[in-house]
């Protein structure tokens, strides 16, 4: 029977900069029941606070609701693991909410085959940013990535769309049914999950010739 091993806070994520959650990995339990507590303070403060919500984020997590989340202050946190034989602390972790945003997937993915008379046909893809992300403030720059593949293909074809919310793809296989998805990330945040797939049938007369 031993004191617990050192835990590690390994992940923090915010869906929209208004709330966030951090998760830790327990160290060894020393063969005894072990209690974990996360304490934190914010830059410029000395007063330590305990995690406001151990439930919402699931096991080994701490959730900071709206009233506990500030974009203006860096959070300094650590996890304490305690059993009957002693305690151990994680390294201190610094968190700036701006840099942990992982948005929801983009919305309203629309895909259409366009066949202009005077130009090459193309696949036109359009989407909207996730609802929870406020792009009007200016500091939130979302980048987008599209992936598509014929229904039975194994490999995805990936296109980086930058900040635009529509995209054209020229080279497609006629007569095939394609799956299309889009995801987004803030410049210094994390990729969202892929949006639900949209299917599009490419007409047999879709030509790739000049």
């Amino acid at each position: 029977q031993l004191p617990p091993g050192k835990p590690e806070i390994f992940k923090c994520r915010s869906p929209n900069k208004e709330t966030f959650t951090c998760w830790w990995r327990p160290g060894t339990d020393g063969g005894l029941p072990t209690n974990y507590s996360l304490t934190y303070h914010r830059e410029g403060e000395t007063l330590m606070h305990e995690c406001p919500d151990y439930i919402t984020g699931g096991p080994n997590s701490c959730h900071f609701g709206k009233q506990y989340t500030s974009m203006w202050r860096t959070y300094i946190m650590m996890v304490n693991a305690t059993n009957q034989m002693g305690s151990s602390f994680s390294d201190e972790l610094y968190v700036d909410v701006t840099y942990i945003v992982q948005p929801d997937p983009p919305l309203e993915l629309a895909v259409e085959v366009k066949q202009p008379e005077d130009r090459k046909p193309y696949l036109w893809i359009k989407w909207s940013p996730p609802t929870l992300i406020d792009l009007k403030t200016g500091w939130f720059t979302l980048l987008y990535e599209i992936r598509l593949k014929p229904e039975k293909a194994a490999e995805w074809e990936i296109h980086f769309a930058g900040q635009q919310t529509e995209f054209k793809i020229l080279s497609l296989h006629p007569g095939q049914k394609y799956l299309v998805q889009v995801r987004c990330k803030p410049d210094h945040g994390y990729w969202s999950a892929w949006s639900p797939a949209t299917f599009i049938q490419i007409p047999s007369d879709f030509t790739m010739n000049d």
Epitope: E8, F10, K11, C12, R25, E43, G44, M71, W72, T74, D91, L93, Y94, V95, D96, T98, Y99, I100, T137, G138, W139, K185, H188, Y190, W191
Partner: antibody
């Protein structure tokens, strides 16, 4: 204990490439961005670029765009910085550095001296 | 790119005396999220840089309280209230509000 251990010194010819490694330990490699910063002899510090090892997303200093490639190997918890078309002005100590969930550098590697000489 | 200008270039200080380093940026360092990402690093002789102050005025873990940072917008200052022998090295200000991140040219602090 968080450690960033870099590869050894290199001597390279002008026009060639160099690949410097940075092996991370003591934390979950995919959690934090790794940055590369260089320092020419007797000079200041210059940021080259960064990588998110979780998905290999990169941002580069435009000054080096096209010449620098930053990669990460999750299986070995190692980040790499490759600089091509070397010239004598690229003689410098190259550092890798790690952030938290922030954009400043809390941990630094020991540095790798790259000398470009004919 | 944001140009960071440090003054003075070098500083010779008697142990126990204060020291002050100035850093000026060519553009405001206030991020659109309201934060100011101006940091100070110290590079001791023969060593890698180490973080002293983050976001203008916050001491990093383990940094003695004789170090303090202040400023806003484009003008920033690092102060050492009582210089000690272990404080020798080159001090760099750095901004990470705008990409590419940039550093000042450095201020060399030595002991008289």
């Amino acid at each position: 204990e968080v450690q960033l251990v870099q590869s050894g010194a290199e001597v390279k010819k002008p026009g060639s490439s160099v690949k410097v490694s940075c092996k991370a330990s003591g934390y979950t490699f995919t959690s934090y961005w790794i940055h590369w910063v260089r320092q020419a002899p007797g000079q200041g510090l210059e940021w080259m670029g960064e990588i998110d090892p979780s998905d290999s997303y990169t941002n580069y200093n435009q000054k080096f765009k096209g010449r620098v490639t930053i990669t990460a190997d999750k299986s070995t918890s190692t980040a790499y910085m490759e600089l091509s078309s070397l010239r004598s002005e690229d003689t410098a100590v190259y550092y890798c550095a790690r952030s938290f969930f922030t954009n400043w550098f809390a941990y630094w590697g020991q540095g790798t001296l790259v000398t470009v000489s004919s | 790119d944001i140009v960071m200008t440090q003054t003075p270039l070098s500083l010779s200080v008697t142990p126990g005396q204060p020291a002050s380093i100035s850093c000026r940026s060519s553009q405001s360092l206030v991020h659109s999220n309201g934060n100011t990402y101006l940091h100070w690093y110290l590079q001791k002789p023969g060593q890698s840089p180490q973080l002293l102050i983050y976001k203008v005025s916050n001491r990093f873990s383990g940094v003695p309280d004789r170090f303090s940072g202040s400023g806003s917008g484009t003008d920033f200052t690092l102060k050492i209230s009582r210089v000690e022998a272990e404080d020798v090295g080159v001090y760099y200000c750095s901004q990470s509000t705008h990409v590419p991140f940039t550093f000042g040219g450095g201020t060399k602090v030595e002991i008289k």
